[in-house]
């Protein structure tokens, strides 16, 4: 079954997908589409890369990570409820039936009603995230800094977010781990 990822309306959704290229200039074509991965290519394509470039993308979709190192994780900006559904990341490895296909389920939740931001701070400023890719990801640690990909913005809601959003499980299941601090 597909791994589930969550985001709130108005935030950015992050859908992880990785592979290990032979070299930064020797990449594998990748496509992202909305809907289950079909027999070939991607349906309702929203982004596509080739051996060197990101050669197709639509307005709210972009690659959060360094695709030259195989991080083809998709960011969807300013999500709405209509963005909910299954997304396909297809790594188009040369050869017959060699493609790697990942179906990821995105669940969009209505935006939380929050009180006036008296003590609100950017979560990432206080707790820089270290996303360490493992397994099929590039063998390095990347400090992601204050980026709007995981959508945790208030320190006061950190515990609830980690529990409710299944963030830790999501990242673990996708071959990545998250460390706070």
């Amino acid at each position: 079954s597909e791994v589930e990822y969550r985001a709130e309306v108005g935030q950015n959704a992050y859908l992880p997908c990785f592979y290990t290229p032979a070299a930064p200039g020797n990449l594998v074509p990748v496509c992202w589409g909305k809907g289950f991965c079909p027999w070939s290519q991607c349906t309702n394509e929203v982004l596509r890369t080739d051996e060197r470039d990101v050669n197709y993308w639509t307005s709210r979709y972009w690659l959060n990570g360094d695709f030259r190192k195989g991080d083809v994780s998709l960011t969807i900006e300013n999500v709405t409820l209509a963005d909910s559904g299954i997304y396909c990341c297809r790594i188009q490895i040369p050869g017959i039936m060699n493609d790697e296909k990942f179906n990821l389920k995105l669940v969009i939740k209505p935006a939380k009603v929050t009180p006036a931001p008296t003590r609100q701070r950017d979560f990432t400023a206080a707790f820089p995230r270290m996303l360490t890719t493992r397994g099929h990801g590039p063998a390095e640690t990347q400090t992601l800094g204050s980026l709007p990909d995981i959508n945790l913005t208030q320190i006061s809601t950190l515990a609830n977010e980690l529990r409710d959003s299944r963030l830790a499980n999501d990242l673990r299941d996708s071959g990545a781990t998250i460390r706070i601090g």
Partner: antibody, heavy 121, light 107 residues
Framework: QVQLQESGPGLVKPSETLSLTCTVS??????????WNWIRQPPGKGLEWIGY???????NYNPSLKSRVTISLDTSKNQFSLKLSSVTAADTAVYYC?????????????WGQGTLVTVSS | EIVLTQSPATLSLSPGERATLSCRAS??????LAWYQQKPGQAPRLLIY???NRATGIPARFSGSGSGTDFTLTISSLEPEDFAVYYC?????????FGQGTKLEIK
């Protein structure tokens, strides 16, 4: 209009570390898609790509310099930096920062004016 | 890494003449070749990318052609401001590499 501006000391002693900073203005620095590069040009010679940093912090270096190069970024200041250790006279060059986009990888569409760094005791 | 060889090293022409600059790659780079112009004391400026596409704001007198290992930058009618050094650069193989340059000077 995107503008890049290099800054740093113009003179570095042999065996020391060269440090330069590039400040980016008028563009979307903390946004996916853009790669921030360092390229150098020894006096009277051609250009050599040194390395890049992506806004996520991911880096990639020219194998010929990899053991001595570190590129980092400070998104709060719209800056990225180059450190080149154990310099010799062969590292004397004009150092440029430049940008490329993932829709045309390694095609450098915006450059800084360059800063000359001389390695001498 | 791929070596790019530019010729001639220096080209002496007069305004109004046609300039033809050559860049040869040590192995095929398909069409992944760019041309840059550099004037004294200035940064390189992107002219042509992917062998034949003019960058934004580049005059139509600049054109690029070629594929594989042999490429040409043509300036159809030289203007005084075109006298500079021109570099080719490949992005087919990593790392990206540059040619040594052709100096276009006033005859």
């Amino acid at each position: 209009q995107v503008q890049l501006q290099e800054s740093g000391p113009g003179l570095v002693k042999p065996s020391e570390t060269l440090s330069l900073t590039c400040t980016v203005s008028g563009g979307s620095f903390s946004r996916g898609g853009y790669y921030w590069n360092w390229i150098r040009q020894p006096p009277g010679k051609g250009l050599e790509w040194i390395g890049y940093i992506y806004y996520s912090g991911s880096t990639n270096y020219n194998p010929s310099l990899k053991s001595r190069v570190t590129i980092s970024l400070d998104t709060s200041k719209n800056q990225f930096s180059l450190k080149l250790s154990s310099v010799t006279a062969a590292d004397t060059a004009v150092y440029y920062c430049a940008r490329d986009h993932y829709s045309s990888s390694w095609t450098f569409d915006y450059w800084g004016q360059g800063t000359l760094v001389t390695v001498s005791s | 890494e791929i070596v790019l060889t530019q010729s001639p090293a220096t080209l002496s022409l007069s305004p109004g003449e046609r300039a033809t600059l050559s860049c040869r790659a040590s192995q095929s780079v398909s069409s992944y070749l760019a041309w840059y112009q550099q004037k004294p004391g200035q940064a390189p400026r992107l002219l042509i990318y992917d062998a034949s596409n003019r960058a934004t704001g580049i005059p139509a007198r600049f054109s690029g052609s070629g594929s594989g290992t042999d490429f040409t930058l043509t300036i159809s009618s030289l203007e005084p401001e075109d006298f500079a050094v021109y570099y080719c650069q490949q992005r087919s193989n990593w790392p990206p590499t540059f040619g040594q340059g052709t100096k276009l000077e006033i005859k």
